[in-house]
């Protein structure tokens, strides 16, 4: 970067090289060039010469002032006009950054995806900081009082093998960057309560010719969890509103769910599950499309036909045993 150049002087920023976005800043350039008394000192931002707000401080130093600096990153360098030199002489350069201190991390969530061997912890980091921000995830056993820390720049996967302090833990997240540090509230977890079953997948659909044609959706999961509650949502692709159907499921065999749908309409289906009575749901499965026939013939949609361009990390909770309209969209 610009900071690796050989300098014939010094460039510095006040209040600092990394500063809060929107601040007024001063960039100073001090020449130290043998037998060159600079006639002029020039500043460049991202290769473009600055024309205004430059003040000569003394024989070798000038200051460039910016009001309300809003660029997340800029490369600055300065040059000297040396007498009898035919081009400007480079003095020094520096990369500067502006951004925000981190918000308090909230919505700390830890889940264990079945078979993953990891506890995955995520959180809402808040507003974009624009600068390098690190997160330290603290995991403290409530049984042994032992605390482990994990450094990351986004979410963290913690091997369940490393969680040797029993089943109950406190988890909290510390966010830090050059402009500040914040800490989340503590989340209390029990490892048995945060397991999310292996993903449920819709494999195919068929519409069966009957007095009233019905569509059967085939779906399955590799979960070994016995008590699983699932939701399937569906809608015509032209609709905004989802219909949601709930199931208490035993995945010892492929599930078949029946729907009475309008003919000659393209529908989309998604499914998700949770361990019955627990807190966390799977994300919604990939979108599965099925078009009902105009009339009688049997139509089958195969799994390989479904679109996977949106897996939609969504949650909807409704009362068991009801067919519900869900127009809440994707909420966690």
């Amino acid at each position: 970067g610009i900071t690796n150049i050989n300098c014939s002087g010094h460039i510095w920023v006040e209040p600092a090289t990394i500063f809060k976005m929107g601040m007024n800043i001063s960039i100073y350039c001090q020449a130290a060039i043998k037998n060159c008394q600079p006639r002029k000192l020039h500043f460049y931002k991202n290769g473009i010469k600055e024309r205004f707000q430059i003040t000569r401080i003394n024989k070798t130093t000038a200051r460039l002032w910016y009001k309300n600096f809003l660029e997340p990153h800029a490369s600055m360098y300065c040059t000297a006009e040396c007498p009898k030199h035919f081009q400007e002489t480079l003095i020094c350069g520096k990369d500067i950054s502006s951004g925000y201190p981190p918000d308090i991390p909230d919505e700390v969530t830890c889940v264990i995806y079945e078979y993953s061997g990891n506890m995955t912890c995520t959180w809402n980091a808040g507003k974009l900081t624009y600068i390098d921000t690190k997160y330290v995830v603290h995991v403290k056993s409530l049984e042994t009082e032992e605390e482990q820390q994990y450094l990351t720049s986004s979410y963290i996967n913690i091997s369940t093998d490393s969680l040797q302090g029993g089943k109950k833990y406190l988890v909290w997240v510390q966010a830090a960057n050059a402009l500040g540090m914040e800490e989340s509230k503590q989340l209390q977890i029990h490892l048995d309560d945060i397991v999310i079953p292996s993903a449920a997948v819709i494999s195919r659909a068929e519409t069966i010719n009957a007095t009233v044609p019905k569509t059967i959706i085939y779906w399955d999961s590799q979960t070994t969890i016995e008590k699983v509650s699932c939701e399937m949502r569906y809608k015509a692709t032209t609709n905004q509103t989802w219909n949601v159907k709930e199931f208490d499921t035993n995945f010892t065999y492929v599930q078949q769910s029946e729907f009475y749908l309008e003919p000659n309409i393209k529908y989309v289906f998604q499914v998700r599950c949770q361990e019955t009575g627990k807190r966390y749901w799977q994300p919604w499965s990939s979108l599965f499309f099925h078009k009902t026939p105009e009339t009688v013939p049997q139509v089958t949609s195969k799994a390989f036909q479904h679109d996977t361009w949106n897996s939609g990390l969504t949650v909807a909770s409704i009362s068991t045993g009801h067919l519900t309209s869900d127009n809440r969209g994707d909420i966690g």
């Epitope: 043998k34 037998n35 060159c36 008394q37 006639r39 024989k59 007498p83 009898k84």
Partner: antibody
Framework: QVQVVQSGAEVKKPGASVKVSCKVS????????IHWVRQVPGKGLEWMGG????????IYAQKFQGRVTMTEDTSTDTAYMELNNLRSEDTAVYYC??????????WGQGTLVTVSS | DIQMTQSPSSVSASVGDRVTITCRAS??????LAWYQQKPGKAPKVLIY???SLQSGVPSRFSGSGSGTDFTLTVSGLQPEDFGTYYC?????????FGPGTKVDIK
Amino acid sequence: QVQVVQSGAEVKKPGASVKVSCKVSGYTLIELAIHWVRQVPGKGLEWMGGFDPEHGETIYAQKFQGRVTMTEDTSTDTAYMELNNLRSEDTAVYYCAILEAGDLDCWGQGTLVTVSS
Amino acid sequence: DIQMTQSPSSVSASVGDRVTITCRASQGISNWLAWYQQKPGKAPKVLIYTASSLQSGVPSRFSGSGSGTDFTLTVSGLQPEDFGTYYCQQANSFPFTFGPGTKVDIK
């Protein structure tokens, strides 16, 4: 184009002080490195001191250290050289000159300082 | 301090002659050397800077060469107005120092 005009001739008694001025135009003093050179009548040129832009400070020749002070008034673009505790051997023409690319490019017309009892 | 020596100390030459003045530094000064011409009662005037660069407005019959410790000023085709004393000056390190001068007069 830079121009340099120095103050007029001075006659001083031994032990006295002299302050020679050097007014620049065409550029501001903040853009220039001023040096002072003297020449004893019939002798060569002798560098007394000047501004070192590499280190951002005024450097004095060892011979004049503690006896000479070089100052600047940026509001009037005037440089000054004050020499204290004058001796007869300080009788000389004193020049201010502007450093360019290692040379002293633009010189004042010189100020004759005569030290005589 | 860096000592500067010049030779010859004086030279008499005719108009049209080629005159060479040498300057030696007591230690290496790269190309940080300038040459000046001074006429009686006047301030010195720079002819050459950084050993070989001709100062703007100076006739091309003046040229400089050298690097390190040994330097040369050459006047190829001396003119009547070229009489005076010539000084070299090092600017490699402080204190700046001048050579003792070479006096050139016209035969």
